[in-house]
Interface confidence: low
């Protein structure tokens, strides 16, 4: 008599998570009499997936009616597939007996489950860095299968090449994770820049998934300082300006010192943005020249974003300004008038 064949025609089947998987199996003969069972895996640790005679298998249904006479199709459908269902499934013929004896196994069908990667999450450096420094951004996405995946980095539309990417685990798994680090060299113009991490995978039917990070969270643009004297006013007051330009973020404290003594402290707030995302701030100090015997050393001291203070000094030459007759010559500071230019 012809030897019984158990035919599993597909070596592999790939299914999206949440879909149903059909695992085909036919036998070439009705004899000998005995049941068919489905297992995941081989050997002593194999897992029973479906047994027509007994057991409760709520997610598994036969494709054709196994009770009808002369049925030789023992294909099954597994519903609501998850990555945990991945593995090799064997259709096994038993000879009826007490107990039933395993007679022949099909070649097996490998079920791979396609699971979408999670939305990429991009994280930047913990502390800000200045222009010309390199900062690292990390992108992570999890829970995808199969392992093949493409990840690309872009900064303002340009693909980045200084990238290191790892997919874990290295061996077989029900799902995988990707972690990629991109190194970006900052420029002073990067306040409005953005990095994008783009993940493409077999499960994504349209555009890749994207995660973004703004370089504004990673960059510090230190200010330029300039102290200038305006022409002296008729009332013997000299207008001194401290221009603080092109800085980011806005967190900035400005202190005026007269001959080393604190005259006034101001905090920047609600400044308008420049086109490149940086800020400018101008502070004015009125110095009453007639209140001073000697030259006045004015210092504009700027503390930006918690960094060490930056100073710019300017000497107002008192000798160059003749004092008014009978004016009070005691060293008193009347320079309390100020204006902020926004």
């Amino acid at each position: 008599e012809e030897e019984l064949q158990v035919i599993q025609p597909e070596k592999s089947v790939s299914v999206a998570a949440g879909d149903s998987a059909t695992l085909n199996c036919t036998v070439s003969s009705l004899i000998p009499v005995g049941p068919i069972q489905w297992f995941r895996g081989a050997g002593p640790g194999r897992e029973l997936i479906y047994n027509l005679k007994e057991g409760h298998f709520p997610r598994v249904t036969p494709v054709s009616d196994p009770t009808k006479r002369n049925n030789m199709d023992f294909s099954i459908r597994i519903s609501n597939i998850t990555p945990a269902d991945a593995g090799t499934y064997y259709c096994v013929k038993f000879r009826k007996g007490s107990p039933d004896v395993e007679l022949k196994s099909g070649a097996g069908t490998e079920l791979s489950v396609r699971a979408k990667p999670s939305a990429p999450v991009v994280s930047g450096p913990a502390v800000r860095a200045t222009a010309e420094h390199t900062v690292s951004f990390t992108c992570e996405s999890h829970g995808f299968s199969p392992r093949d995946i493409t990840l690309k980095w872009f900064k303002n539309g340009n693909e980045l090449s200084d990238v290191q990417t790892n997919v874990d685990p290295a061996g077989k798994s029900v799902s995988y994770s990707i972690r990629s680090t991109a190194r970006v060299v900052l420029t002073r113009r990067d306040v409005h820049s953005q990095v994008i991490c783009e993940v493409a995978h077999v499960t994504l039917q349209g555009d890749p998934l994207r995660g973004t990070a703004n370089l504004s969270e990673a960059i510090r643009v230190p200010p330029f300082l300039e102290v200038t004297q305006q022409s002296m006013r008729a009332d013997n007051q000299v207008n001194v300006t401290c221009q603080v330009t092109k800085f980011y973020p806005q967190r900035l404290q400005l202190t005026w010192l007269e001959n080393g003594n604190v005259s006034r402290t101001e905090m920047a707030s609600a400044l308008p943005e420049n086109k490149d995302g940086t800020y400018n701030w101008t502070s004015w100090l009125l110095v009453n020249v007639s209140a001073h015997r000697d030259d006045v050393k004015l210092t504009c001291q700027v503390e930006h974003d918690g960094q060490p203070a930056v100073n710019k000094s300017f000497s107002v030459k008192v000798s160059a300004h003749p004092k008014e007759q009978g004016s009070n010559t005691a060293a008193e500071n009347t320079g309390t008038n100020e204006r902020n230019i926004y």
Partner: antibody, heavy 123, light 107 residues
Framework: QIQLVQSGPELRKPGETVKISCKAS????????MNWVKQAPGKVLKWMGF????????TYADDFKGRFAFSLETSASTAYLQINNLKNEDTATYFC????????????????WGQGTSLTVSS | DIVMTQSQKFMSTSIGDRVSVTCKAS??????LAWYQQKPGQSPKALIF???YRYIGVPDRFTGSGSGTDFTLTITNVQSEDLAEYFC?????????FGAGTKLELK
């Protein structure tokens, strides 16, 4: 580096069959769809369709249904374009071109191209 | 089918100039638009995808812009190696379609 290398120029008579190959290297072949594009002399580039290298399923543009067949030899990272019952108007350069990493996505932008295979059909 | 119109078949330029190649889609394609450069006897070379993203290795003198139906490829400081034909292509809707091309030549 990533390369798509196509087979050499072909001269055929009307009614014959031709099979053009495109061998990919430098990347994971089954991660990117392979498209075919026709460039006839003096005519606009014409997208013929693509084959999903992950599933082997071909998709043809309407003008290329019937006499045209895309196939794969995955183990050799090679895609094929076969044209049956050749006509004079099949005279053109045929390019294979890879779709960016969109896998199952229908088409996309083409980041790498083969050097092209010139086909001349003449009696 | 979506028709991609490149109204200028030829454009004359000088080395160092700035030139803009335009492309119009017959219907909205979002930003699913790519630009290619082709030199005689060569295969097309990918320049831009998603309307404005440069491929790695493409000089930053090439800039893509636009969305919806109107797109522009701008080349600033044109170099001699930029003298070639430029094609746009939409990949929003099947069938994927190309523009007829714009040839950049010296004045």
């Amino acid at each position: 580096q990533i390369q798509l290398v196509q087979s050499g120029p072909e001269l055929r008579k009307p009614g014959e069959t031709v099979k053009i190959s495109c061998k990919a290297s430098g990347y994971s072949f089954t991660n990117y769809a392979m498209n075919w594009v026709k460039q006839a002399p003096g005519k606009v580039l014409k997208w013929m369709g693509f084959i999903n290298t992950y599933t082997g399923e071909p998709t043809y543009a309407d003008d290329f249904k019937g006499r045209f067949a895309f196939s794969l030899e995955t183990s050799a990272s090679t895609a094929y374009l076969q044209i049956n019952n050749l006509k004079n108007e099949d005279t053109a350069t045929y390019f294979c071109t890879r779709t960016r990493g969109y896998y199952d996505f229908d088409g996309g932008a083409f980041d790498y191209w083969g050097q092209g295979t010139s086909l001349t059909v003449s009696s | 089918d979506i028709v991609m119109t490149q109204s200028q078949k030829f454009m004359s330029t000088s080395i160092g100039d700035r030139v803009s190649v335009t492309c119009k889609a017959s219907q909205n394609v979002g930003t699913h638009l790519a630009w290619y450069q082709q030199k005689p006897g060569q295969s097309p070379k990918a320049l831009i995808f998603s309307a404005s993203y440069r491929y790695i290795g493409v000089p930053d003198r090439f800039t893509g812009s636009g969305s919806g139906t109107d797109f522009t490829l701008t080349i600033t400081n044109v170099q001699s190696e930029d003298l070639a034909e430029y094609f746009c292509q939409q990949y929003n809707t099947y069938p994927l379609t190309f523009g007829a091309g714009t040839k950049l030549e010296l004045k």
